[in-house]
Every structure is written in structure tokens, then in C-alpha cells.
Interface confidence: medium
């Protein structure tokens, strides 16, 4: 029994996939695909605004954490990387690039530095940082 | 211009994918797909033999490191996890489950414990460990 048919238009062959297996994506070439979301880790250090612009130029946004279950690959991420979370001083809330508010219990926010942007660190931690500080960053593209 | 057509047999719809985007896999459901390899990180601690058996039961093997370029997602992996590397005392070499010898300069082998198995740690390090010690583990399935 086969669950899907992938039509490879280049060779015009059908590749059959077992029910337990599936394709992931589509994602930009050489990005990580997990539970139909696309992720890429960028080594070069940029400030938050430059990181955001870099993701946008690739039709993506900075990392948005929306589910510990769907994004459990983030548990094991080493080091610190810009994500798309910013502090809104007027109401004191933390919100994502798309305007949605950070859900409670998703991230442990750690306020060591003074700042309005946040770095993602393993085990769903968010470290507040000055937005002008250069850091590596994670871009994300949702496919669903 | 579109690079591929994915035929969704459930809804019988064609989804067009830009040239710069592609599907990854196929992989077991909810595994990580990267450069057409499938990876899964398992939280439960098992000894090396149990970890190997767990991967095999999922039609996969313990992690094999074969390319820093194709597997650069492994740079950022936190913690220590069994991989498919074992020491062959008769000739002193390190080899993978498939019998191939560890290529030079792929891993930095660090002899912390006396043992014949190896844990993967970030930035392409391999920590020697007693094969009977319980650890988390990484399974891998190559799709190409």
C-alpha cells in the first residue's frame, strides 16, 4: 500500500513511498525540513534588523516558536541565535514579526542584558539582547 | 518557471514549486530531512546496542558522519548522542556500522572514557565511551 505518488517531471518516473514515509516541504534548497516547516541556521553574525532583512530576502522570516511539539528539534540547538521576537515597550509584551503575541509557557525569557530583541537558545529559552548586537540567526519558512 | 510537480493523490491537486524550492525525502514521518538525508534524535537513553536495534527497527542506522558540508546541521547539535561508530580492537581503526572506515579529518576523536563506541557531540567531535553506557542517540536514513 502506498500513500503518495511523486511525479518527477525531469525523468517522468513515478517513485512510490510507503505509508509510513513522506516528503517534507517544499523548502528553499538545502534548508532543513521538519514537520513541514523549513529552517536555516546562518553562521554570519548580523544585528537583529539585518538578520530580519536577510530572512525576508529569502522569502522567510526570523524563527517563530509556536509549538514545543511541532518544533521539538529546537530543543537540541546549540548556541544563541536571533529569532523574530521583539519587545513592545508601550505595552510591555513580546511579539513576533507577524504581530502575534508570545504565548505563555512557550519560552523561558531570560533578562540578562537590556534590550528589545531576543535570542533563541536550546530547550526553548529566549535571551533578551540589544537589537544592535551582532549574532547568528535562524530563518524559518512555514509551508502550511 | 517551475521545477517539479507534486501530485497529491488525496485531493488530486497539483502544487507547483518554484525552481529554488524542493521537497526533501522521503523520510519516516516526523523525521528531520536535510539534503535528502533523514535524521531523528531520540530522547530515551539506551546503550549502544539497544540504540542500534532501535534505529534498525525503524529501517535506519545510527548516525554516520560522512561529510561536513552535507551534514553541516550537525555543527549545532547540543549534548552527546550515540552514533554508528565503533572501534575495531584488532586493527585499531574506527568504522561505521556499514563496515566503512572513518575518513580522516571528519571527526575529532576525544578519548575521555575507555570504550569501543563513540558519542557524537557538536562541531564534529566524537567522544569515546563504553558501549554499555546509556545515552540518547541519533538515527539516520539515507535517501540517495
Amino acid at each position: 500500500i502506498w500513500s503518495a505518488v511523486f511525479l518527477n517531471s525531469l525523468f517522468n518516473q513515478e517513485v512510490q513511498i510507503p505509508l509510513t514515509e513522506s516528503y517534507c516541504g517544499p523548502c528553499p534548497k538545502n534548508w532543513i525540513c521538519y514537520k513541514n516547516n523549513c529552517y536555516q541556521f546562518f553562521d554570519e553574525s548580523k544585528n537583529w534588523y539585518e538578520s530580519q532583512a536577510s530572512c525576508m530576502s529569502q522569502n522567510a522570516s526570523l524563527l517563530k516558536v509556536y509549538s514545543k511539539e511541532d518544533q521539538d528539534l529546537l530543543k537540541l540547538v546549540k548556541s544563541y541565535h536571533w529569532m523574530g521576537l521583539v519587545h513592545i515597550p508601550t505595552n510591555g509584551s513580546w511579539q513576533w514579526e507577524d504581530g502575534s503575541i508570545l504565548s505563555p509557557n512557550l519560552l523561558t525569557i531570560i533578562e540578562m542584558q537590556k534590550g528589545d530583541c531576543a535570542l533563541y537558545a536550546s530547550s526553548f529559552k529566549g535571551y533578551i539582547e540589544n537589537c544592535s548586537t551582532p549574532n547568528t540567526y535562524i530563518c524559518m519558512q512555514r509551508t502550511v | 518557471i517551475w521545477s517539479a510537480v507534486f501530485l497529491n493523490s488525496l485531493f488530486n491537486q497539483e502544487v507547483q514549486i518554484p525552481l529554488t524550492e524542493s521537497y526533501c525525502g522521503p523520510c519516516p514521518k516526523n523525521w528531520i530531512c536535510y539534503k535528502n538525508n533523514c535524521y531523528q534524535f531520540f530522547d530515551e537513553s539506551k546503550n549502544w546496542y539497544e540504540s542500534q536495534a532501535s534505529c534498525m527497527s525503524q529501517n535506519a542506522s545510527l548516525l554516520k558522519v560522512y561529510s561536513k558540508e552535507d551534514q553541516d546541521l550537525l555543527k549545532l547539535v547540543k549534548s552527546y548522542h550515540w552514533m554508528g561508530l565503533v572501534h575495531i580492537p584488532t586493527n585499531g581503526s574506527w568504522q561505521w556500522e556499514d563496515g566503512s572506515i572513518l575518513s580522516p579529518n571528519l571527526l575529532t576523536i576525544i578519548e575521555m572514557q575507555k570504550g569501543d563506541c563513540a558519542l557524537y557531540a557538536s562541531s564534529f567531535k566524537g567522544y569515546i565511551e563504553n558501549c554499555s553506557t546509556p545515552n540518547t542517540y541519533i538515527c539516520m536514513q539515507r535517501t540517495v
Epitope: Y80, I110, E111, M112, Q113, K114, Y127 | -
Partner: nanobody, 120 residues
Framework: QVQLVQSGGGLVQPGGSLRLSCAAS????????MSWVRQAPGKGLEWVSA????????YYAESMKGRFTTSRDNAKNTLYLQMNSLKPEDTALYYC?????????????WGQGTQVTVSS
């Protein structure tokens, strides 16, 4: 330029107390987390504690928890390390530093160091 000037070290008996100070200048003190690091004779650097910019969050190395307290006075641009129940193994050169090595590993400015000797 960034300057961190330390004071308050000295000789103390086991079980005694000392308070170290670190006066900061040349930067906006309350923008930064701060840390204490020490180096025992013939040993490498050992992280002691870190404190957030506001002083609301502190972290300590396991062996110092309950004995050492890090605080700061942002109005005075000064960082403090209160050391109680001192042991001979606390003998070291103590440094204050800008940043939070426990969290980010980035200490970009250091004090001159102050010697603490615990001996009877």
C-alpha cells in the same frame, strides 16, 4: 574607554567574610550583565557568578551557591561580590568582567583583579 576598577580583597580566616567591589566607567553600566571570575594559584579561570543588567537575575557556580552573593548598584555604577563562609580553596585572584559568561560566554572587559587569601 571602558574601565573596571576593583577593590576590597585581602587576607581572611576560614569561615570569615569579604566584600569585593568593582567600579565601572566609560560605558552605560545598566545596559550590561556583569560577571565575577576567579583564578586560583596554578589553575585556570573559573566562573563565579553573573548578574543581569537590572540585578533581578543572578547565577552562581555550584560550589559558591549559598555562600556568595552578587549584587549591583546601577546608580553608583558598581558591582559587588559578598563572600561568606570562606574556605581555603576560595583563595584566588578575583576579576569582575562585563558580560555574562555563564549564558553567552562573552566577557569583553575586565577589572585588574583583586587577591583574596583564605588562611589561618
Amino acid at each position: 574607554q571602558v574601565q573596571l576598577v576593583q577593590s576590597g580583597g585581602g587576607l581572611v580566616q576560614p569561615g570569615g567574610s569579604l566584600r569585593l567591589s568593582c567600579a565601572a566607567s566609560g560605558f552605560t553600566f545598566d545596559d550590561y550583565a556583569m560577571s565575577w571570575v576567579r583564578q586560583a594559584p596554578g589553575k585556570g579561570l573559573e566562573w563565579v557568578s553573573a548578574i543581569s543588567w537590572s540585578g533581578r537575575t543572578t547565577y552562581y557556580a555550584e560550589s559558591m551557591k549559598g555562600r556568595f552573593t552578587t549584587s549591583r548598584d546601577n546608580a553608583k555604577n558598581t558591582l559587588y561580590l559578598q563572600m561568606n563562609s570562606l574556605k581555603p580553596e576560595d583563595t584566588a585572584l578575583y576579576y569582575c568582567a562585563r558580560g555574562d559568561v555563564a549564558i553567552r560566554g562573552n566577557l569583553d572587559a575586565w577589572g585588574q583583579g583583586t587577591q583574596v587569601t583564605v588562611s589561618s
